[in-house]
């Protein structure tokens, strides 16, 4: 069994979130990812639940009940979702800092958007495809 | 020409985004995307990015000069990422609207904490990729 | 300060079995994720394995063939090298490396550290 | 493979500039860090930039660490050669088994 097993089934204790009726309303995530079977559709699900999940966990962080799980688990997500490359974990957690509501971080933001935009869809990076997709678009 | 590339350059002089000073002490998204190849890398990336924008036109929703630039970049980016599939930007919109500090948001993120970790490799999803892994992990 | 200190090393014939030690100190060892590598004489590094720090993840050279089996004891703030069928081309100085906080948490820079390293020879 | 090729031996005068490359094999050299270790002969490593382009503190800033995306390759610079800068330089990336990959090394020597 995974280290993250019982880590997880400690955090269930603490935030009491073992009980039936926290699935009432379903699910936050499952639902959402049974959805998706293509890796790429996949990983965009999971990057925000990943990022939600960090941030969590960063409320959490001063409190020493629950200090070994939380790092037990994250160290698993780093190692299941990020492959143990730091440098990925890196660039994730740069992305999932900056503040919407920093005034130089919008005007980078909206300096690089034409440039981000032209990235956007798998076409921009192989002309098969794109070529493919034009016979769609008319 | 794509249309969002009009309606940037109206949000570049909007938010006074097109003075070179904005380049100052590196890209926040460029040099990032630079980094990954992998189309499955690009979408971790690329999924916190298009939150990152959702999140900056959010803010600026209720200015009228600005108004058809940032919806006709929504629109656009609902193609090019989520390939205008309706479900699949509904399912991201949720996953990003979600409160991580909602007591009943938590518990169910905990509740469910197991069963997403589970999902997070893509050896989780194919029985070869995870007999080769488990060479390397004794 | 950070000391990391091997032993273990000696000689042994071809066929025969080692186990290596490495006693970590001045950092919070069950944070870290740990490495072991080898130089032969006279030749370049070469990575052996690796372990994460609370979830036990293992990575080995393929060139190893299931021979070496690491392992950590984070009560003890020890990492260990078990190798098996030794064989002369085996023969180097083995070096313990820190490596960095896999959940992140003030995350440090990976192979930072080192010990001096313990030689190993394999000779009949 | 996903070897990370170093040229074997490169010299050059106290107070020049030395550049010793790393070119990945296979994989994109972008996608992973990548480390710079300098062993004086008898001596333990010790990592003179990490994470591509950062310095350890005590590290002199006349080395530096890049990367070549068109090159697929990695950099180490030392300008202003002095004779203590000799000695054998490693760089070190991962694949993507999360196996740690060293280049064959580079012997520097100061003429």
């Known amino acids: 069994q995974d280290p993250y097993v019982k880590e997880a089934e400690n955090l269930k204790k603490y935030f009491n979130a073992g009980h039936s009726d926290v699935a009432d309303n379903g699910t936050l995530f499952l639902g959402i990812l049974k959805n998706w079977k293509e890796e790429s559709d996949r990983k965009i699900m999971q990057s925000q639940i990943v990022s939600f999940y960090f941030k969590l966990f960063k409320n959490f962080k001063d409190d020493q009940s629950i200090q070994k799980s939380v790092e037990t688990i994250k160290e698993d997500m780093n190692v299941k979702f990020f492959n143990s490359n730091k440098k990925k974990r890196d660039d994730f957690e740069k992305l999932t800092n900056y503040s919407v509501t920093d005034l130089n971080v919008q005007r980078k933001a909206i300096h690089e958007l034409i440039q981000v935009m032209a990235e956007l869809s798998p076409a921009a990076k192989t002309g098969k495809r794109k070529r493919s997709q034009m016979l769609f678009r008319g | 020409q794509d249309p969002y590339v009009k309606e940037a350059e109206n949000l570049k002089k909007y938010f006074n985004a097109g003075h070179s000073d904005v380049a100052d002490n590196g890209t926040l998204f460029l040099g990032i995307l630079k980094n990954w190849k992998e189309e499955s890398d690009r979408k971790i990336m690329q999924s916190q990015i298009v939150s990152f924008y959702f999140k900056l036109f959010k803010n600026f929703k209720d200015d009228q000069s600005i108004q058809k630039s940032v919806e006709t970049i929504k629109e656009d980016m609902n193609v090019k990422f989520f390939n205008s599939n309706k479900k699949k930007r509904d399912d991201f919109e949720k996953l990003t609207n979600y409160s991580v500090t909602d007591l009943n948001v938590q518990r169910k993120a905990i509740h469910e904490l197991i069963q997403v970790m589970a999902e997070l490799s893509p050896a989780a999803k194919t029985g070869k990729r995870k007999r080769s892994q488990m060479l390397f992990r004794g | 300060e950070v000391q990391l200190v091997e032993s273990g090393g000696g000689l042994v014939k071809p066929g025969g079995s080692l186990r290596l030690s490495c006693a970590a100190s001045?950092?919070?060892?069950?944070?870290?994720?740990m490495h072991w590598v080898r130089q032969a004489p006279g030749k370049g590094l070469e990575w052996v394995s690796s372990?994460?720090?609370?979830?036990?993840?293992?990575y080995y050279a393929d060139s190893l063939k299931g021979r070496f089996l690491i392992s950590r004891d984070n009560d003890r703030d020890s990492l260990y090298l078990e190798m098996n069928s030794l064989g002369v081309e085996d023969t180097a100085i083995y070096f313990c490396?820190?490596?960095?906080?896999?959940?992140?948490?003030?995350?440090?820079?990976?192979?930072?550290?080192w010990g001096q390293g313990t030689l190993v020879t394999v000779s009949s | 493979n996903f070897m990370l090729t170093q040229p074997h031996s490169v010299s050059e005068s106290p107070g020049k500039t030395i550049t010793i490359s790393c070119t990945r094999g296979?994989?994109?050299?972008?996608?992973?860090?990548v480390q710079w270790y300098q062993q004086r002969p008898g001596g333990v490593p010790k990592i003179v930039v990490f994470?591509?382009?950062?310095?350890p503190s005590g590290v002199p800033d006349r080395i530096s660490g890049s990367i070549d995306t068109s090159t697929n390759s990695a950099s180490l610079t030392i300008s202003g050669l002095q004779t203590e800068d000799e000695a054998d330089y490693y760089c070190?990336?991962?694949?993507?088994?999360?196996?740690?990959?060293f280049g064959g090394g580079t012997k520097l020597t100061v003429l």
């Open positions: 070190q990336s991962y694949d993507d088994a999360n196996h740690v990959i």
């Open positions: 994470e591509d382009t950062q310095r």
């Open positions: 001045g950092f919070p060892f069950s944070r870290y994720s």
């Open positions: 372990m994460t720090s609370r979830t036990n993840h293992k």
């Open positions: 490396a820190r490596g960095y906080d896999t959940s992140g948490s003030d995350s440090g820079v990976d192979f930072q550290y």
């Open positions: 296979r994989g994109y050299i972008a996608s992973y860090y």
